[in-house]
């Protein structure tokens, strides 16, 4: 039975040209996390596999950095980065858990400077 829950940063905003950390956290389960996929819409951004390490999609190699932890750092943000991001946690023995984050990339003067997980 799947007892875990995914906690995410929820709706976040960041400044154009800046960086943001996408972070999910799996709680309320003792299941072992064996892989985490990060996606935007239908595009695979990155995978962190317990045995194989990190893989960053070539399309995002210049702007995506692994971590911290199982999170993902997006750099050099543009307004086109606005949208939904998904973390897909592969676990044993529970199965798959999914979390959703909505990122809004704003012009510099509009973004909230205190947004959680935001990198100055």
């Amino acid at each position: 039975m799947m007892t875990g829950t995914i906690e995410t940063t929820g709706n976040i905003s960041a400044e154009k040209g800046g960086s943001i950390i996408l972070q999910c956290h799996l709680s309320s389960t003792t299941a072992q996390v064996t892989q985490v996929n990060w996606e935007q819409q239908d595009q695979l951004l990155a995978i962190c596999n317990a045995d194989l390490g990190w893989h960053i999609s070539p399309s995002f190699k210049d702007r995506v950095a692994p971590g911290p932890g199982l999170g993902l750092t997006l750099q050099s943000l543009t307004v086109n980065d606005t949208g939904e991001y998904f973390c897909i946690y592969h676990t044993y023995p529970d199965g798959t858990y999914t979390g959703r984050i909505f990122l809004e990339v704003l012009e510099s003067s509009v973004a909230e400077h205190g947004a959680r997980f935001q990198i100055p």
Epitope: N37, E39, S59, T96
Partner: antibody, heavy 118, light 107 residues
Framework: QVQLQESGPGLVKPSQTLSLTCTVS?????????WNWIRQPPGKGLEWMGY???????RYNPSLKSRVTISRDTSKNQFSLKLSSVTAADTAVYYC???????????WGQGTLVTVSS | DIQMTQSPSSLSASVGDRVTITCKAS??????VAWYQQKPGKAPKLLIY???YRMTGVPSRFSGSGSGTDFTFTISSLQPEDFATYYC?????????FGQGTRLEIK
Amino acid sequence: QVQLQESGPGLVKPSQTLSLTCTVSGYSITDDYAWNWIRQPPGKGLEWMGYISYSGHTRYNPSLKSRVTISRDTSKNQFSLKLSSVTAADTAVYYCARKYYGSWFPDWGQGTLVTVSS
Amino acid sequence: DIQMTQSPSSLSASVGDRVTITCKASQDVFTAVAWYQQKPGKAPKLLIYSASYRMTGVPSRFSGSGSGTDFTFTISSLQPEDFATYYCQQSYSTPWTFGQGTRLEIK
């Protein structure tokens, strides 16, 4: 449990437009996921055609992009496929399917055979 | 587009046999591969996702492995209900593409 059911004409004339509908039960297509069309010519492999997401975003296979349109009717919890200018090569079993995050397909309709012939 | 090349295209085996099907991607897809089983007149059924993760309810005799460009699907001990056609699919980038299929027949 989500269930998908395709419906539409089984015979379409060459150069006409193929139109199919997928009715989804057990889940609202506006709640989550992407809702896809995948086809399989007789005795051949599978070809992903495109999807409409829960938010209404569409994406199509570039090999079909100029001919394919996927739309939805949220009031009926249905999504539809239109494929224009069909030829005999479009004869296939057409499936609707739900895409899960990670881009695999755990739920499929039973499929409907569409024959293109005059 | 990423091409998925499956081999063999057909295979004859007996109940109890161990069977292996391979799938080669035309570029690195890391672990983004799924495997499906299709019986005549039926829709494909998802067995394995992310190269090695079994769907809930799928018997443990079905397994998948591999990363990068080379992937393997194994049935450890064939059962009568396993005779079907099997497809790999890359879930790495659109357009999502499938292998041409491997037909598993009774010897």
